[in-house]
Amino acid sequence: MRTEAQVPALQPPEPGLEGAMGHRTLVLPWVLLTLCVTAGTPEVWVQVRMEATELSSFTIRCGFLGSGSISLVTVSWGGPNGAGGTTLAVLHPERGIRQWAPARQARWETQSSISLILEGSGASSPCANTTFCCKFASFPEGSWEACGSLPPSSDPGLSAPPTPAPILRADLAGILGVSGVLLFGCVYLLHLLRRHKHRPAPRLQPSRTSPQAPRARAWAPSQASQAALHVPYATINTSCRPATLDTAHPHGGPSWWASLPTHAAHRPQGPAAWASTPIPARGSFVSVENGLYAQAGERPPHTGPGLTLFPDPRGPRAMEGPLGVR
């Protein structure tokens, strides 16, 4: 959901063009600025997990990655909200939370993410291939909906939390490699600029090869930060099938908000509000990655609830863990 920006390619300056040097180096900050700014429009993530201990229990977590403020979140199952989906919960930042069976507990996790615990035994409980959707209404972006279901590899009996053996995923390694090259390019440009500034009046002398700037190293987050960002498993419930459409809950505007002592709206304002909730991490490591995706005309893929850089018994797909960043 982002307008794409064409980022000019970074090229090393040609040695002979001394006059163009100043202009060329002026371009660099703009290119870098473009990389930072283009990471702007919304994305929605949906995470569906089945509890290993309670096979009929699921947790759905949804998040909105955008700059606007969220005015309403609707969670549905069986398809998108406007296409046969059945509303499970509606969360309003001021007027509170309304939920319908088999939803057990809906809550705000952060100002831009929610979680919903589902459980059930019988006709109204979800199955493993049920689609869950979250619709975020936000200002000024408008409304955006995304859906998710259990991943193909998640065998309920085997879905134990991944073991924290820190390993860098291949795509991350690639990104870090490219960011290293980019950084090296920038350092090299600055080096050339400084050399150009301090160069004495041209004199005939043998050219000296400039010492190569050390290659910048991109670091993976420490194990401590990985552990801090790792998402704890929560819960939701299965014997199968969304409630039939005749028992579907209201899809219209929430006229019932007025009579709503159901759950007081609880939206954590600070990092300490939900101890178990991963707070989106912001850091240079991530900025570089986001910048690279912006350059490639794409939003970074790691934009979900928590960073997982661990191998997973479920295979390479599961290793592609979400990373809570904007």
Partner: nanobody, 126 residues
Framework: QVQLVESGGGLVQSGGSLRLSCAAS????????MGWFRQAPGKEREFVGR??????????SYADFVKGRFTLYGNQARNTVYLQMNSLKVEDTAVYYC?????????????????WGQGTQVTVSS
């Protein structure tokens, strides 16, 4: 060989709804990213939206013109993706193409997708 087959296109009145489906067949591996693009007559192919699967989390991103009218959802196990289009406008008339990627880096650039469907025509009349 992997084939992506789109269906669900057709003629619809302005303000109406359509659901496009895209299914992968053949010797498929799990797709990490599936997206929709569209091409209106005389225009370039443009990105509509994409869905990316990453473990138990699904990431969905749309083009700005979608403005909440379209919803993209799918099933990675079946390599199937749907595009639910509501409040259709005449300017949504185009051939809609499905694209898939078996490498986990998502993209809205055409050349970054491994597989493409033949397209399905969507015509919105006033």
């Amino acid at each position: 060989q992997v084939q992506l087959v789109e269906s669900g296109g057709g003629l619809v009145q302005s303000g109406g709804s359509l659901r496009l489906s895209c299914a992968a067949s053949g010797r498929t591996r799990s797709m990490y990213v599936m997206g929709w693009f569209r091409q209106a007559p005389g225009k370039e192919r443009e990105f509509v939206g994409r869905i990316k699967w990453s473990g138990d989390t699904t990431y969905t991103s749309y083009a700005d013109f979608v403005k909440g009218r379209f919803t993209l959802y799918g099933n990675q196990a079946r390599n199937t993706v749907y595009l639910q289009m509501n409040s259709l406008k005449v300017e949504d008339t185009a051939v809609y193409y499905c694209a898939g990627r078996v490498v986990p880096l998502p993209s809205r650039q055409r050349d970054r997708y491994d597989y493409w469907g033949q397209g399905t025509q969507v015509t919105v009349s006033s």
